[in-house]
């Protein structure tokens, strides 16, 4: 088997064996090494010398195998836009941002640029759980049977109705999607408006 060519090597068809880690240099018609993540090209390749790479300075990065002559500057997460940092910038990765709690991403341009407050879900509903927090605005869904939610809130969850018998009480009024069951002491008389039900 033929030995693997090591950059720089000639390329007649303008393609390189390892597209991720090599690139075609048209002036000399050769394949040269790209620089690994966290580095940049400090000296370009020639026919007799491969690319020379240097580490990105502090507060700058390159995320991919590259033949860039500069590193990208780190940009902080902008709290005015509702963003917060989840991981700092490193030489190999830009600052990782997410929407602050209670917010969702309202504008994307390769990454989230602008977060907005999550909409309230009205009583009787709750926000549908999402795979990823902060990805979209609340979609409110009705509380399932036997549950209630009695506030306007972006994050309140539907709770199960109280079971009066578990507390040694009896039901005075059934729960709804917006209110809990009302319980009373079994010895207490029913309020006047419910006395008819008692006779039934």
């Amino acid at each position: 088997s033929q030995p693997q060519a090591v950059p720089p090597y000639a390329s007649e068809n303008q393609t390189c064996r390892d597209q991720e880690k090599e690139y075609y240099e048209p002036q000399h018609r050769i394949c040269c090494s790209r620089c690994p993540p966290g580095t940049y090209v400090s000296a370009k390749c020639s026919r007799i010398r491969d690319t020379v790479c240097a580490t990105c300075a502090e507060n700058s990065y390159n995320e991919h195998w590259n033949y860039l002559t500069i590193c990208q500057l780190c940009r902080p997460c902008d709290p005015v836009m509702g963003l917060e940092e989840i991981a700092p910038c490193t030489s190999k990765r830009k600052t990782q941002c997410r929407c602050q709690p209670g917010m969702f991403c309202a504008a994307w341009a390769l990454e989230c640029t602008h977060c907005e407050l999550l909409s309230d879900c009205p009583p009787g509903t709750e926000a549908e759980l999402k795979d990823e927090v902060g990805k979209g605005n609340n979609h409110c869904v009705p509380c399932k049977a036997g549950h209630f939610q009695n506030t306007s809130s972006p994050s309140a969850r539907c709770q199960p109705h109280t079971r009066c018998e578990n507390q040694g009480l009896v039901e005075a009024a059934p729960g709804t999607a917006q209110s809990d069951t009302t319980c009373k002491n079994p010895l207490e008389p029913l309020p006047p408006e419910m006395s008819g039900t008692m006779l039934m």
Epitope: I70, Q72, L73, R75, P76, D78, P79, V80, M81, G82, L83, A106, A107, A109, T113, H114, E116, L117
Partner: antibody
């Protein structure tokens, strides 16, 4: 239609105070960051301050830091700029602007003139 | 702070001309560059955001290009209503800064 209407400008003596207001309509005010930008007579634009949609985060230009305070009342759809210890160099037309994406100002008010002079 | 330098400071041109205004940042700002038009006594108006994106409602004769430190605003065929002052603005980080402006006048 998005509308921003500034008010509160006027003549004030050096060292005095003034509060500018910007009434917003035509969009969900609390969802957007807002900013103040000023322009001295015959000069270019100078950014003054920015505030998040919730009002929890703010930034200021060095030239006004410690003297100006940006705030907002989302229940009234109104942005404010409290200006204290005013100087002659603060004389300018003050514009409020909707600050979008953390990049640019997509809507501007018509401006209000602040004159600081004795 | 990031300094924004526009050139030229003023420019005379005729209706129908192709005009280019340049803006240079003192450090790399990626594509966080916007262009505004301002007419006397009026508020600025957004033309281009993110270096090359045309704001809704802005005529297609306006275009922007560039990345890093060097940017250009081009008006492909000047119309009478285009005579105004143009500003670039960086949105990379605070304090947000504007160029000093380019006044476009009728020749």
């Amino acid at each position: 239609e998005v509308q921003l209407l500034e008010s509160g400008g006027g003549l004030v003596q050096p060292g005095g105070s003034l509060r500018l207001s910007c009434a917003a309509s035509g969009f969900t005010f609390s969802s957007y960051a807002m900013s103040w930008v000023r322009q001295a007579p015959g000069k270019g634009l100078e950014w003054v301050s920015a505030i998040s949609g919730s009002g929890g985060s703010t930034y200021y230009a060095d030239s006004v830091k410690g003297r100006f305070t940006i705030s907002r009342d989302n229940s009234k759809n109104t942005l404010y700029l409290q200006m204290n210890s005013l100087r002659a160099e603060d004389t300018a037309v003050y514009y409020c602007a909707r600050y979008y994406w953390g990049w640019y100002f997509d809507y501007w008010g018509q401006g209000t003139l602040v004159t600081v002079s004795s | 702070d990031i300094q924004m330098t526009q050139s030229p400071s003023s420019l005379s041109a005729s209706v129908g001309d192709r005009v280019t205004i340049t803006c240079r940042a003192s450090q790399s700002i990626s594509s966080y560059l916007n262009w505004y038009q301002q007419k006397p006594g009026k508020a600025p108006k957004l033309l281009i955001y993110a270096a090359s994106s045309l704001q809704s409602g802005v005529p297609s004769r306006f275009s922007g290009s560039g990345s890093g430190t060097d940017f250009t605003l081009t008006i492909s065929s000047l119309q009478p209503e285009d005579f105004a002052t143009y500003y670039c603005q960086q949105g990379w980080w605070y304090p947000l800064t504007f160029g000093q402006g380019t006044k476009l006048e009728i020749k």
